[in-house]
Interface confidence: low
Amino acid sequence: ADNFSLHDALSGSGNPNPQGWPGAWGNQPAGAGGYPGASYPGAYPGQAPPGAYPGQAPPGAYPGAPGAYPGAPAPGVYPGPPSGPGAYPSSGQPSATGAYPATGPYGAPAGPLIVPYNLPLPGGVVPRMLITILGTVKPNANRIALDFQRGNDVAFHFNPRFNENNRRVIVCNTKLDNNWGREERQSVFPFESGKPFKIQVLVEPDHFKVAVNDAHLLQYNHRVKKLNEISKLGISGDIDLTSASYTMI
């Protein structure tokens, strides 16, 4: 077994039923909707090495995408604020000290946003942080992607796929040093083409919890340890994006 356990280092996840999180889903057992006992990169005997999955998108691209994430910065470079509409919020962001006030929410201005959209998370993510994304799935949608990014790494890739070999599936993964790791797949699929949705991501000490339309969907164990450096959320895919924001709960 690997000799690092974030769960051991950061045990306990606070209030199991926090305000703002779906009430009936706040106290799931470890691995609910996800992968009980999921381990960390490199811990899977006989696992194909990251990047070795047949049909995988080229390095630097998101799985299932035709190419690289549009507008993605070169490694090690954080982009300056975009000049177009629907870009970074002009005010209301907490400072990049890593401390979030207990009030909020902070995030995108109201109204339609241009996709792909980058939501800055200036202090990184911290336990009890709740990210909420509202939008509508486009008709005949193929994919949605949320990418919690740490520089050029993708700490958490949440990727609903509407037609993968005629099946609907949600794929979660992590990309480190341009290599994708072991996919975690979820067959429960709460998205519908042409319909509105609400995605909520709750950061816990040892995992991300994801709820869609107020129902708990899955959780994903942290593979990237430095949560405070996960400083951007990329939102892409076949959606009309209404809002993206975060608050502490």
């Epitope: 490199g42 990047g51 995988q56 080229p58 630097g60 490694p75 290599n179």
Partner: antibody, heavy 117, light 110 residues
Framework: EVQLVESGGSLVKPGGSLRLSCAAS????????MNWVRQAPGKGLEWISN????????YYADFVKGRFTISRDNAKNSLYLQMNSLRAEDTAVYYC??????????WGRGTLVTVSS | QSVLTQPASVSGSPGQSITISCAGT?????????VAWYQQHPGKAPKLMIY???YRPSGVSNRFSGSKSGNTASLTISGLQAEDEADYYC??????????FGGGTKLEIK
Amino acid sequence: EVQLVESGGSLVKPGGSLRLSCAASGFTFSNYNMNWVRQAPGKGLEWISNIDGSSRYIYYADFVKGRFTISRDNAKNSLYLQMNSLRAEDTAVYYCVRSYYGGMDVWGRGTLVTVSS
Amino acid sequence: QSVLTQPASVSGSPGQSITISCAGTSSDVGGYYNVAWYQQHPGKAPKLMIYYDSYRPSGVSNRFSGSKSGNTASLTISGLQAEDEADYYCSSSTGYSTRVFGGGTKLEIK
């Protein structure tokens, strides 16, 4: 079997040029970042350069910038290092290495480059 | 001169544990990315032993463990065996693909 095999090392005069090649097999070459690392006789390891799978992102150590050029041909499963303006201090075994989660997990056996008049 | 500082040599007896340190700065070891450790026997290519600070590739003995605190990374080898005698190098990312190595540590088994 995952394998990297370097070639092209030889004796060259100061100021001369050399092109190293690395043949990759046993894995999907285009999916991986690749590196060149060198080791002078009796000395430690020195990272030289890195190239991503699509040749979009390329990085060099300061001591080779402007003199060495890394490239790859995914169709041929090959990595290259073009070395110009060679100096005596470039004498070393040059390794072709695959990136893996911030480490480097597959190494070739190396090819010796000797720069001497 | 190496950017990362390692002791030139360490020694231990079979069955003992030893720790090799790798001191850097907030721009490398203590910064954004991660540390890897390599073992190199004379005349051989290096072998990856630890990556992403503390993970072992498959096939590497669990006697090898990695950790990081602040600007210093450490490799610990427990239950020393004769075949552990080798040179050990730490490496850190300084950006997203750029890397630096330590000067290496020679491990002697008494």
